[in-house]
């Protein structure tokens, strides 16, 4: 059985069949006599009860609200109500891209490693019994595959496999032909094994400061998920109440690695903060990398060549 629609925010493409299935379905069967209602609210109107009479495109079956098909004006909030159970969804219907076989905003991205197993299977369990045929397209060019009920690609991944794969299911309902499109953006990468982590920027940084002011030293690295980045300063970390390590920020790169940055904030800079090493280290099983920062009083800048300064 098709699982219920648990996502509260849903984006769909106009002109395709679509359904909402509430998540107390098994419960609803047990209490057949209980009143079950579907409502819609949009900007202009509040809580309008839905039934097949409200639109020829809407069908109600047990736990499901079906659209044949969904259209732009179906955008809004939908509610299912049964006794003291309520479920709400926010539906956003977007315009179909008429110049392509798929709509860019409705694409699922996948990263596959080269020479590893690459699989795409075209399935749609909810509409399975109504599907006449299914076609698989790569970059909107139809692939001639053996099985036209559930076309499948299973192969060793190659760089040339990169692209947009669209499963298009063709189905009939009440004498009309509909299609449902599911598109995958497949990116082929070399591999996602561990890299040797590296700190970005020069290994030694002189930072010009003024006494009594604050400074933020930013340490950035390219690293693996399990690697750590940390600051070392003074004889005992944490002995200076004016020095604070900020929360580490991480962003995933397209290759599946991480770009991390950790800021060391020095407040109310004093003489004791000048001309000492503030070391940032990235550590992993593959080794470590360290870069150093030295705070220099602005007045002393003339003694240091220009190329060693960082902002």
């Amino acid at each position: 059985a098709e699982s219920c629609t648990s996502r509260p925010h849903i984006t769909v493409v106009e002109g395709e069949p679509f359904y909402l299935k509430h998540c107390s379905c098994s419960l609803a069967h047990e209490i057949e006599t209980t009143t079950k209602s579907w409502y819609k609210s949009s900007g202009s109107q509040e809580h309008v009860e839905l039934n097949p009479r409200s639109s020829s495109r809407i069908a109600l079956h047990d736990c499901v609200l079906e659209f044949w098909p969904v259209e732009l004006n179906d955008t809004g909030s939908y509610f299912f109500q049964m006794k003291n159970y309520t479920q709400k969804w926010k539906l956003n219907v977007i315009r179909r891209n008429k110049h392509s076989c798929f709509t860019e905003r409705q694409v699922t991205s996948k990263i596959v490693e080269v020479k590893k197993f690459f699989q795409i299977t075209c399935e749609n369990s909810y509409y399975q019994t109504l599907v006449n045929s299914t076609s698989l397209y790569k970059n909107c060019k139809k692939l001639l595959l053996e099985n036209n009920k559930n076309p499948t690609i299973k192969k060793n991944a190659e760089f040339e496999d990169q692209g947009y794969y669209s499963c298009v299911h063709f189905l009939h309902h009440n004498g009309k032909l509909f299609n449902i499109t599911k598109t995958f953006n497949i990116t082929i990468v070399e591999d996602r094994s561990n890299i040797v982590p590296v700190l970005l920027g020069p290994k030694l940084n002189h930072v010009a400061v003024e006494l009594g002011k604050n400074v933020r030293l930013n340490c950035s690295a390219l690293l693996n998920e399990e690697d750590v980045i940390y600051w070392m300063f003074g004889e005992e970390n944490g002995s200076d109440p004016n020095i604070h390590e900020e929360k580490e920020m991480r962003i995933m790169t397209p290759e599946g690695k991480w770009h991390a940055s950790k800021v060391l904030r020095i407040e109310n800079i004093g003489e004791s903060n000048l001309n000492v090493l503030y070391n940032c280290t990235v550590a992993s099983t593959g080794g470590t990398d360290t870069k150093s920062f030295i705070l220099v009083r602005k007045a002393d800048m003339a003694d240091i060549p220009g190329h060693v300064f960082t902002r």
Partner: antibody, heavy 118, light 112 residues
């Protein structure tokens, strides 16, 4: 010219491990994946897995998962295949083979005979 | 895994005669997106490693004599030696590289 030179024959006891090396020359070692294939006496060829010498990334055949480890040392252009918990049916000639980029193998090492016997 | 089955297991052919080896895969190794068959043929002489003869089912590796040719598509493939020479005595293997990598059991070619 491209050459893959493997380490010499080994005799091992059941339960032990063996590490076979494959030294590459005549091409950029990190530019091509390296596969390992074995051949039991009088038998056919069996794919074991590959290593990407550039990153150290690996992909092992399901049959060998947990027993095989493929590594490399880029400084000496050498790939290694270590097989642990050896059994008598691991007696075979082990080959390294270069993947020329299109999934098929264009150059092979001369082979290393590994005999597992008590 | 894709199972590769070669026939015959052994073959005796007179010098100068044609030798034909068949290879059948348990599922298609043809990919319509690039019109390629993911199949290679190897030659292995006693005490030597396999040597690549043919890839993409019909492309001859450089340096391989033109008496060797590959044909077929989908699940059925053939390696043909148009005029057998003494140095062609060997075991020949087909290999698919479409889903992981698997080899046929080999065909031994001898002189009659």
């Amino acid at each position: 010219q491209v050459q893959l030179v493997q380490s010499g024959a080994e005799v091992k006891k059941p339960g032990a491990s063996v590490k076979v090396s494959c030294k590459a020359s005549g091409y950029t070692f990190t530019g091509y994946y390296m596969h390992w294939v074995r051949q039991a006496p009088g038998q056919g060829l069996e794919w074991m897995g590959w290593i990407n010498p550039n990153s150290g990334g690996t992909n092992y055949a399901q049959k060998f998962q947990g027993r095989v480890t493929m590594t490399r040392d880029t400084s000496i252009s050498t790939a290694y295949m270590e097989l642990s918990r050896l059994r008598s049916d691991d007696t075979a000639v082990y080959y390294c083979a270069r993947d020329m980029g299109d999934l098929f193998f264009d150059y092979w090492g001369q082979g290393t005979l590994v005999t597992v016997s008590s | 895994d894709i199972v590769m089955t070669q026939s015959p297991d052994s073959l005796a052919v007179s010098l100068g005669e044609r030798a034909t080896i068949n290879c059948k895969s348990s599922q298609s190794v043809f990919y319509s997106s690039n019109n390629k068959n993911y199949l290679a043929w190897f030659q292995q002489k006693p005490g030597q490693p396999p040597k690549l003869l043919i890839y993409w089912a019909s492309t001859r590796e450089s340096g391989v004599p033109d008496r060797f040719s590959g044909s077929g598509s989908g699940t059925d493939f053939t390696l043909t030696i148009s005029s057998l020479q003494a140095e062609d005595v060997a075991v020949y293997y087909c290999q698919q590289y479409f889903i992981t990598w698997t080899f046929g059991q080999g065909t031994k070619v001898e002189i009659k």
